[in-house]
Amino acid sequence: NIDVCKLGTVTVQPAPVIPLGSAANISCSLNPKQGCSHYPSSNELILLKFVNDVLVENLHGKKVHDHTGHSSTFQVTNLSLGMTLFVCKLNCSNSQKKPPVPVCGVEISVGVAPEPPQNISCVQEGENGTVACSWNSGKVTYLKTNYTLQLSGPNNLTCQKQCFSDNRQNCNRLDLGINLSPDLAESRFIVRVTAINDLGNSSSLPHTFTFLDIVIPLPPWDIRINFLNASGSRGTLQWEDEGQVVLNQLRYQPLNSTSWNMVNATNAKGKYDLRDLRPFTEYEFQISSKLHLSGGSWSNWSESLRTRTPEEEPVGILDIWYMKQDIDYDRQQISLFWKSLNPSEARGKILHYQVTLQEVTKKTTLQNTTRHTSWTRVIPRTGAWTASVSAANSKGASAPTHINIVDLCGTGLLAPHQVSAKSENMDNILVTWQPPKKADSAVREYIVEWRALQPGSITKFPPHWLRIPPDNMSALISENIKPYICYEIRVHALSESQGGCSSIRGDSKHKAPVSGPHITAITEKKERLFISWTHIPFPEQRGCILHYRIYWKERDSTAQPELCEIQYRRSQNSHPISSLQPRVTYVLWMTAVTAAGESPQGNEREFCPQGKAN
């Protein structure tokens, strides 16, 4: 509530706004009859410097002139850019207990003169928009700086707008609020920006433009697509544009794509036919416009139209495989399997599959539709059977794929040779083979088929397979390959009416098994011991078991045990050994071996043979 400058005045020379690097003199003068009562000679004027409301310096030592009791002049130097506050206070030295009294204050602004504005750019958004220009102001001046944008054109057209920059706002764009119309298309316009502050002024170079240079059309709107006769590959894209647009750019892509298809359309008048679309595919469409074929700017891209193209009937052929097993004395069960079409072949949502099993000679035909990718039927074991499958969507069905049902492993002469399986990495296996040696009919193709060596449902866990051309002798299998699981792999060689196959086991990664086989019984028959066991549970095998080892040693013996190594066969669960002495108690146990090493031992069993030894 105090009148801060009641006691005196503060003045600045040369001015309260100074260029960076300049010094200033600040004079503090007491008004008549103001000051310390009774003792004018005890008046002491001090000057305090504040930056951002924080006291940073007492300029007592910067006095350059002192009129005792009436005025003091202080020189200030090295002022930083921006505003600095100086406050003059009166200190009555005879009264040590009273704080100094404010006399008056002054703000000094340190800045620079404006640089000439550069890079002027003007735009008018749409035919009915207004001209707005932006520029680069150059270095910050730290002072309030006024900018004036002036436009001049034909027919004595002049227009100007102003704005200012200070420490709270920046002025580098102005909308003139005028509209340039297409009838001025050939006319030239000049704009200039002038900057002025307390330390100087500057002007930009004149910037000349035409209507076409600065008018950016509005992006097209109301985009839609019409598919001709519900076609999935042909459609007419339609949109609304400003009246003067002569050129459009269209871009479109499937939603999961990373590259756009680009099309330029001249005088399209809001309509363009697309002929290369993929059926049943989510697309994104965008359009941009230009007012002139050679000059002018493209509009921003329109908002995206996202839509799915209609379905078309499936193309391509299904990849079919089958499994057959004798079900009783005169019937066999045929399980057909097929792979789903990829989206570019399905060209729609597959509603069902049409399956046909036909006996060639008797013309018996079994037909059915299924939504699954497998189908099982029991048929007579006699006769030559063929199967076909086609996929159907709402627009139609694919051409049926045919396969002859032959005994897949029936012809030894067609069995591929030297089949091997090598683990390539964690999730694939390289299978190689040599062609059949004495095939009496040409190999049309190889099928590499694999199944996990784990119990599974025949229909719920279909086989995995790859079709290989007849001149290839290797396949990298990766579908559904998991580490630490053993797979049985079959390589089939197929001719027109016969099949031969060879099997091998393989894994993509292996560890030593978790445990050894469990010995369930030891029996003595005709001077031989038969060891019976249960196999290691599948999850504990951790890869393909190569062989089992049966160990034995005399009870309480510290000697190394003897061992017998047996090739692993899943169908085998007992083995004879014949080198044990009668009436000696032995301890027996078993281990299992994968390519990674040997398991810990299984359970121990004691046995004392009774019969005559070898």
């Epitope: 699954h372 996990a452 784990q454 599974g456 449902s457 866990f461 049985e488 079959r490 899943r570």
Partner: nanobody
Framework: QVQLQESGGGLVQPGGSLRLSCTAS????????MYWYRQAPGKQREFVAY???????NYLDSVNGRFTISRDNAKNSVYLQMNSLKPEDTAVYYC?????????????WGQGTQVTVSS
């Protein structure tokens, strides 16, 4: 191992009905494909019907339309509803389960239940 137990057989007049049941126990986590077979005196065992994991069923031609196979997964059971029975349906009926390990098919059989169709 998998154990299968049939029940529901008996003596029935021609044109009558019976419902056979088969309950599985043991390591049945991969048993999805279930079958009924039968063996008449002096004849070979023959397939009657099966049901797959996806409930797809198939029948011997001579029983198609009269017999219906179904399953109740919660009870680990499979059933054979036999209607319009004929004397030639007289046989021991066996429940069968198949599973595949690699390319080898493992089969499990029940003890059988006698069905006699006679007036």
């Amino acid at each position: 191992q998998v154990q299968l137990q049939e029940s529901g057989g008996g003596l029935v007049q021609p044109g009558g009905s019976l419902r056979l049941s088969c309950t599985a126990s043991g390591s049945i986590f991969a048993i999805d494909d279930m079958y009924w077979y039968r063996q008449a005196p002096g004849k070979q065992r023959e397939f009657v019907a099966y049901i797959t994991a996806t409930n797809s069923a198939n029948y011997l031609d001579s029983v198609n339309g009269r017999f219906t196979i179904s399953r109740d997964n919660a009870k680990n059971s499979v059933y054979l509803q036999m209607n319009s029975l004929k004397p030639e349906d007289t046989a021991v009926y066996y429940c069968n389960a198949k599973q595949i390990v690699g390319f080898q098919i493992d089969e499990y059989w029940g003890q059988g239940t006698q069905v006699t169709v006679s007036s």
